[in-house]
Every structure is written in structure tokens, then in C-alpha cells.
């Protein structure tokens, strides 16, 4: 015979074809072998011109031989080489599917591999690819979109060889709050790490605001709106700066009175103040907290104290905000000017958390009167807020 070729090669099959001998023959003897694969020999009829090779090993180079027989006579042997395809991984499955995460698992192919190519695509056409190592049989997908259909595909790799892709389809679960209006809703969506998040005032996606969420203190879900920790940020700022906010949300900052007004207008909020100084800690919680709009000069409402720091905010309840360039306090002198800060001053303060960092002069520093008095500037202070009914919401989520 002549012209031996292979076609339709897969990971376990191939079709051998040849041109028949010119003379009439009784039979053809076909043999094939590969590395670490014992030789298989088959005899077929002399009028056959193709033979299906089955049960081949994947990703293996085979040597195929064929010769003709007529009675006791044997023709010369012709040879062809071919390599089977890399077989695919098996049983690709998406498990632990959440709103933004899922776990892909699969069984490895029979052939050895040098890695896997994972491709996952959402219905909107967003495609992501990742290559993982040869010993990997699972991969955690993150940053997925909630309520979205995904197609995940996997292909085994071995050098230049690529297997066929297999796929699975899954749908991420919907977020409880697609546009969380505060850190409590972000937390109820499953975000439990403190850090920067985007919230949407009144749940409006056009009203995005980046905030720092404290997800650990007393159950978490707090929007931090003030942090003092090292004195690097200047808090002796004007009205405009305090209205808009300033500083680095990861470091020292003030979120802004306009933002506080918009947030507390969304519902009933509680205030938490965390204080730390030379290893000592104290806190104050007020179960009613709100900040009025610019027309009220951001009037403070703070009621319902509990905690260990002492109720120093009660003195400031009902007061408008004051800065050195907009004096709304009841003092003849300007409290913000006198004490180099800004606050809901009265005449003047029991709380001066926006005072001069590290200044232990009377009433000048970061003060919380009922904890450390007016002659000790506190090292660390945070003010934060969350919905007053957060405990109920959290319980409902856990039951769900």
C-alpha cells in the first residue's frame, strides 16, 4: 500500500487511510504504538482502505505501520506518525455562587498538563481569561457582577497543545442592595472587610460617594466620617472645606457636612465615637444622630447616650456648626478661632475632636471632656454612623 495518512484525530481516536496495493491482496496488517503504550496489531480485509484507531492515549505521539499480505507474501511496510489531541478536563462545575464570587472546580484530564486556561464571560460580553497551574483543580472567581449569567470555559494546556474547551453556565445571586446607601447595606450585601466602599445616597446610582466602612466595631456597618490618628491632616479649615470634606479616607479625614446631611436624611441613624489613647479605649454611642442642611448651618441632633467615654456630646445637641470664618456659636468670642478647630460649638466645647492634634493646652487639643478632660489631646478618635435599626436588619439577613 501507499499514501498512509491519519485524519479525524481526537484525544482517543484517529482514522488511518491508505492507497490500496496495485495487486490484489488478502489482507492489511495495521500496527500502532506510542511512548509508554504497548503495540496493538490488527488485520483487516484486503479491500479495506481505512481503519478507525480507538482507545488511544491522549497527547501521545503514535507510530502507525501497515503492510499487505497475499498468501505467505508480505509487502514492504509504510509508516506514518500522528499525535493525539490533549484530552479536556472533565466535570467543570460552579459552586458556592454568591453575588460577586463563585468557585469553579473540575477533574483533570488523563494526560499530563502544563496548565489550564480559564475563560469566563458575562452576558454583556465582558470576558476575562486566567491561566492556572497544572496541579490546580479549582479556582475562585471574584469581582463578578450580581444577578448576572456567566459562561465559564476551561481548556487544558500542554506546551503547544490545547484541549477542547468544556463549559458550564451559572448565574450570580442578586445583591440585597444593588446600590447600597450606607455601609450597613454594603455589609448586608456580604462585604465584611473594613475599607473603602462606594455608597449611593438614597440608593441613587448617580449619587455615588466613596466612604470608609468600619465593618468590625460592634457588628460593623459604620460609615466613618471623622478620623484623627497622627496629626498629618490640617483640621483648622474653613466653612467651605468642612461642608465639602477633606483628607484621605484611609488616614485622617472629615467626610463633609453636606454628605452627613444627605446620609442622615435617609433615615434614623446612630452615632458611635471610638477613642484610643496610650492603650486605653473608650466609646460613646448615641441612638439618634442627624445633621441638618446648610440652611440650618448643619444643626446637630444627638440623643440617647450609652458607652464608656461619658456623655460629652449632649452639651452640643441642637447646635449649628462653626468654623473660624462662620461663627454660629453662642460665645461672644469665636470658639473655632479660640480653639483652632471646628465643631458644633456652644460656648465652647466638651468635645473638640477637630482640635489641634497633640496640643495639651487647655481646650485646644483633641478633647472628649468626660473621658480625658480638656488638658489631654487624645491620640486616636473616630466618629461613625449607621442606621439605628441595623441590629434588626442584621438579624433578618441572618435568618434569611
Amino acid at each position: 500500500p501507499s499514501g498512509l495518512v491519519t485524519a479525524n484525530i481526537t484525544d482517543s481516536e484517529a482514522l488511518a487511510r491508505w492507497q490500496p496495493a496495485i495487486a490484489t491482496v488478502d489482507s492489511y496488517v495495521i500496527s500502532y504504538t506510542g511512548e509508554k503504550v504497548p503495540e496493538i496489531t490488527r488485520t483487516v480485509s484486503g479491500n479495506t482502505v481505512e481503519y478507525a484507531l480507538t482507545d488511544l492515549e491522549p497527547a501521545t505521539e503514535y507510530t502507525l505501520r501497515i503492510f499487505a499480505e497475499k498468501g505467505p507474501q508480505k509487502s514492504s511496510t509504510i509508516t506514518a506518525k500522528f499525535t493525539t489531541d490533549l484530552d479536556s478536563p472533565r466535570d467543570l462545575t460552579a459552586t458556592e455562587v454568591q453575588s460577586e464570587t463563585a468557585l469553579l472546580t473540575w477533574r483533570p484530564p488523563r494526560a499530563s498538563v502544563t496548565g489550564y486556561l480559564l475563560v469566563y464571560e458575562s452576558v454583556d460580553g465582558t470576558v476575562k481569561e486566567v491561566i492556572v497551574g497544572p496541579d490546580t483543580t479549582s479556582y475562585s472567581l471574584a469581582d463578578l457582577s450580581p444577578s448576572t449569567h456567566y459562561t465559564a470555559k476551561i481548556q487544558a494546556l500542554n506546551g503547544p497543545l490545547r484541549s477542547n474547551m468544556i463549559q458550564t453556565i451559572f448565574t450570580t445571586i442578586g445583591l440585597l442592595y444593588p446600590f447600597p446607601k450606607d455601609c450597613s447595606q454594603a455589609m448586608l450585601n456580604g462585604d465584611t472587610t473594613s475599607g473603602l466602599y462606594t455608597i449611593y445616597l438614597n440608593g441613587d446610582k448617580a449619587e455615588a460617594l466613596e466612604v470608609f466602612c468600619d465593618m468590625t466595631s460592634d457588628g460593623g456597618g459604620w460609615i466613618v466620617f471623622l478620623r484623627r490618628k497622627n496629626g498629618r491632616e490640617n483640621f483648622y479649615q474653613n466653612w467651605k472645606a468642612y461642608a465639602a470634606g477633606f483628607g484621605d479616607r484611609r488616614e485622617e479625614f472629615w467626610l463633609g457636612l453636606d454628605n452627613l446631611n444627605k446620609i442622615t436624611a435617609q433615615g434614623q441613624y446612630e452615632l458611635r465615637v471610638d477613642l484610643r489613647d496610650h492603650g486605653e479605649t473608650a466609646f460613646a454611642v448615641y441612638d439618634k444622630f442627624s445633621v441638618g442642611d446648610a440652611k440650618t448651618r448643619y444643626k446637630l441632633k444627638v440623643e440617647g447616650y450609652s458607652g464608656t467615654a461619658g456623655d460629652s456630646m449632649a452639651y452640643h445637641n441642637g447646635r449649628s456648626f462653626s468654623t473660624f470664618d462662620k461663627d454660629t456659636d453662642s460665645a461672644i468670642t469665636n470658639c473655632a478661632l479660640s480653639y483652632k478647630g471646628a465643631f458644633w460649638y456652644r460656648n465652647c466645647h466638651r468635645v473638640n475632636l477637630m482640635g489641634r492634634y497633640g496640643d495639651n493646652n487647655h481646650s485646644q487639643g483633641v478633647n472628649w471632656f468626660h473621658w480625658k478632660g480638656h488638658e489631654h489631646s487624645i491620640q486616636f478618635a473616630e466618629m461613625k454612623l449607621r442606621p439605628s435599626n441595623f441590629r434588626n436588619l442584621e438579624g433578618r439577613r441572618k435568618r434569611a
Epitope: 447616650y305 456623655d311 452639651y315 460665645a331 461672644i332 460656648n347
Partner: antibody, heavy 120, light 107 residues
Framework: EVQLVESGGGLVQPGRSLRLSCAAS????????MHWVRQAPGKGLEWVSG????????YYADSVKYRFTISRDNAKNSLYLQMNSLRAEDTALYYC?????????????WGQGTMVTVSS | DIQMTQSPSSLSASVGDRVTITCRAS??????LNWYQQKPGKAPKLLIY???SLQSGVPSRFSGSGSGTDFTLTISSLQPEDFATYYC?????????FGQGTKVDIK
Amino acid sequence: EVQLVESGGGLVQPGRSLRLSCAASGFTFDDYAMHWVRQAPGKGLEWVSGISGSGGSTYYADSVKYRFTISRDNAKNSLYLQMNSLRAEDTALYYCAKDISAVPDTFDIWGQGTMVTVSS
Amino acid sequence: DIQMTQSPSSLSASVGDRVTITCRASQYIQGFLNWYQQKPGKAPKLLIYDASSLQSGVPSRFSGSGSGTDFTLTISSLQPEDFATYYCQQSYSTPQTFGQGTKVDIK
């Protein structure tokens, strides 16, 4: 109209006890701290004791600490002063006073007072 | 405890006079100072809080000033109903202490 009415005063022997009451009306009682202030005959004003709006925090002058106990019943809009181990120097007109805040601050409304006389 | 010292202890004045009473705190108290008026046989009445804020219903002839340790109550034009005893009080810390009082009587 905001009103405070004290009662419970009288003549008592040294070492004995007396309980003063103050009935409040015309305002949301538990939103405000309350106080007792006394005035000995012909003398000035002396703050005696105070209690926060919730009743969770109490405050005393050194002269009455461990002898007097301030308390409140927000459901009944009432303030109390339990006075034990009374001394002659406790003789005074005792005023109940409302604060402007939930914690000790400024006394904006006063009752007319109840007289306590400690004498044998 | 913070000591409050008023001066003078008493003064005689005529209707229409400008009267000034001073109060000194033994330590810095920001503006945590109140003024009360007491007439014989009556309960005290709040006149000024936060050193300079006029209590609702109090005539504008009464005014307060000062900050830190030194404070002043001024009656711009003394009226017959103003003859009384005036007390300052610090609300900075407990115990909340009063001055010894200033008696204003008719000259």
C-alpha cells in the same frame, strides 16, 4: 406650662432619714437631667446632687456623698432624694431643678422648694 | 472643686444705674458660666447661660460677658424689679458650684 413641685420635707432628728419627691409636668421628663439644690437659711445656693435623663449617671456633692441617693422614675415623671444619716448642717430649703440638657449643665426651671429641718 | 468668687458681696444702686457684678473661677472654665437671680422667698431664676446667652423671657437690659476665668453680669439700667440677689454658677464640671451671691439693694 413647665412645673416642678417638691414634697416630703419636714422636721427630722439627726441620724434619721427623709425622702424628698419632685413631681414634674409640662415637658418630656426623660430628655433632661434633674438636680437637687439646697439653700440653708440666710445662705447661698449649694448644688447637692444630679441625675442624667436616662437615670444611668448620678452625681453628688462631697458633703452628701454616701448619705444621699438621687433617683428618678421616668414613667411617673418623678425625681427623688433619699436622705440618710441626716445632720444639722443639712437643714435647708431643698429645690428641685430641671436642666437644659440630658446631662448636668444649666438649671432653667426651679421648683418652689421644700424645707428640711434637722434638729433634736 | 472649682471655687467661684463673686464681687462685690453687696451693692447699693438707684433705679436707672448701670450695675456690674463680677465672678471669678478658680480654674479655666471656657464659657461654662450661668447667672441666676433670686428674690426673697422665691426660687432662683436663670438669667444668662453660657456666659453670654440671654435666657428666653429675660429683659435685654441683662447681659453677660467673659470667658476662661473672669465673667461679668451687667444690668444696663436698673429697674425696681431687679433688686435681688445674683448668683454665678459654673457648669463646667461637677460639683457645679455657685458664687456666694451679690445682693443688690436700693440706695
